[in-house]
């Protein structure tokens, strides 16, 4: 009976949770179509949870197209960050609610807040402005929403998501999630990937900033801009470490920092836990 | 373990009604899309319907649009096919199935005859 | 909307290498499903997205897809290998499609 059933249970290679997918569509291969535009469009990945840039020809393809990565995420990608939503009420804090105030190397003194283990609370410090830890929010409400116990036993989950005691139900909250820090790397890793102007098909690899990986692109032999990479490993050291964003659950994340206003709505958009 | 078990199936006249279900377990049911799925004896598989997991939007075969309507009650983890205005050609054994956006369907239960004759 | 077209049956002496395939227009532009049904058993999914694998499926099953055709490779084959397959798609307005089946023969 086991054996059969253990047939029946389908666990991808890279242990991926349920998909909870906010349209079927988002599940389609993108499609390029048959015609020989180069536009650049996004897809969501159904293997890696993200949303990723792909060529599009211009006409047919399907609807797993989408003109900005931002809408591509309001499509496909709500309720697929594998979100740890709190089932008890006494759940634990994200592992970087007990790591020490980190003022970092950097000689700026901004105002941030961190969770204090000792007393329980969110407090003030200042911080350099660049490295430290993840225990590091721009508001003290911020702080409180992902490390502190909520009042009458709620508990916040990293998502603004807010599980009721009394039937379990979930309250959206408009809550931030932890801000962005700041690129260090060579300028040309938030550069596009360009083709160039010639024929040839060279595999070569691009640092793709908005979801912080290397990725392949075909360059045509000539032309296009310093973000081009004969290897993954030469992409990832050239640009990799340059990028460092905070997540609320399961470590660091590269992405490239966008304009103080647009902060908050990226920073919840592109999270994804790492252990996806 | 994760488990589908479909029920209802059973005999009924051309022009009548049957409503099937299928109990999930094992999975949190409502984070899946859910499909019916049919075969005709000696035949192949032939896809009736699908809901989704969030939207709980339905789509439908052709074959049956108009007639059959599927829905899910996340709270009982159970999935339903109403069939309505049977027909000679929807017998079949019908399966429900735990399905990936529309892809794949990777749980499937063992299955419920529905016999339609006069 | 896709057809998909199988072969209906396929014949492989034991230990050889079994390939069914599944064509239908465009058929690489989308991902493609295989399953395995033995006699009075429910279907089994034995690939995924073109070519993945379930856990507990065994790894002489591969899939591949291209052009207008999807393959499912069985390497090595084996008599419990015997059953029907069936390939399956979707299409853009959110049908799941399957082909018509292959019946595999272990000789």
């Known amino acids: 009976d086991s054996e059969e059933d253990e047939e029946h249970t389908i666990i991808t290679d890279t242990e991926l949770p349920p998909l909870k997918l906010m349209h079927s569509f988002c599940a389609f291969k993108a499609d390029d179509g048959p015609c020989k535009a180069i536009m650049k469009r996004f897809f969501f990945n159904i293997f890696t949870r993200q949303c990723e840039e792909f060529i599009y020809g211009g006409c047919e393809g399907n609807q797993n197209r989408f003109e900005s990565l931002e809408e591509c995420k309001k499509m496909c990608t709500r309720d697929n960050a594998n979100r740890i939503i709190k089932t008890t009420l006494q759940q634990e804090k994200p592992d970087f609610c007990f790591l020490e105030e980190d003022p970092g190397i950097c000689r700026g003194y901004i105002t941030r807040y961190f969770y204090n283990n000792q007393t329980k609370q969110c407090e003030r410090f200042k911080y350099g402005g660049c490295l430290g830890n993840m225990n590091n929010f721009e508001t003290l409400e911020e702080c409180k929403n992902i490390c502190e116990d909520g009042p009458n036993g709620f508990q916040v989950d990293n998502y603004g998501t807010q599980l009721n005691a009394v039937n379990n139900s979930l309250t959206p909250q408009s809550t931030k999630v932890p801000s962005l820090f700041e690129f260090h790397g060579p300028s040309w890793c938030l550069t596009p990937a360009d083709r160039g102007l010639c024929r040839a098909n060279e595999n070569r690899f691009y640092y793709n900033s908005v979801i912080g990986k290397c990725r392949p692109f075909k360059y045509s032999g000539c032309g296009g801009n310093e973000n081009n990479f004969t290897s993954k490993q030469e992409c990832l050291r050239a640009c990799k470490k340059g990028f460092i964003q905070r997540i609320s659950k399961g470590g660091l994340i590269k992405t490239k920092r966008k304009r103080k206003k647009q902060r908050v709505k990226i920073a919840y958009e592109e999270i994804f836990v790492k252990n996806m | 373990q994760v488990q589908l078990v479909e029920s209802g199936g059973g005999l009924v006249q051309p022009g009548g009604s049957l409503r099937l279900s299928c109990a999930a377990s094992g999975f949190t049911f409502n984070d899946y899309a859910m499909s019916w799925v049919r075969q005709a004896p000696g035949k192949g598989l032939e896809w009736v319907s699908l809901i989704e997991s969030v939207s709980s939007s339905t789509y439908y075969a052709d074959s049956v649009k108009g007639r059959f309507t599927i829905s899910r009650d996340n709270s009982k983890n159970t999935l339903y096919l109403q069939m309505n205005s049977l027909r000679a050609e929807d017998t079949a054994v019908y399966y429900c199935?735990?399905?990936?956006?529309?892809?794949?369907?990777?749980?499937w239960g063992q299955g419920t005859l529905v016999t339609v004759s006069s | 909307d896709i057809e998909l077209t199988q072969p209906p049956s396929v014949s492989v002496a034991p230990g050889q290498t079994a390939r069914i395939s599944c064509s239908g227009d465009a058929l690489g532009s989308k991902y493609v499903s295989w399953y395995q049904q033995k006699p009075g058993q429910a279907p089994v999914l034995v690939i995924y997205?073109?070519?993945k694998r379930p856990s507990g499926i065994p790894e002489r099953f591969s899939g591949s897809n291209s052009g207008n055709t999807a393959t499912l490779t069985i390497s090595g084959t084996q008599a419990e290998d015997e059953a029907d397959y069936y390939c399956q798609s979707y299409t853009y307005s959110l049908n799941q499609v399957f082909g018509g089946g292959t019946k595999l023969t272990v000789l």
């Open positions: 199935a735990r399905t990936i956006g529309v892809l794949w369907d990777d749980v």
């Open positions: 997205g073109d070519n």
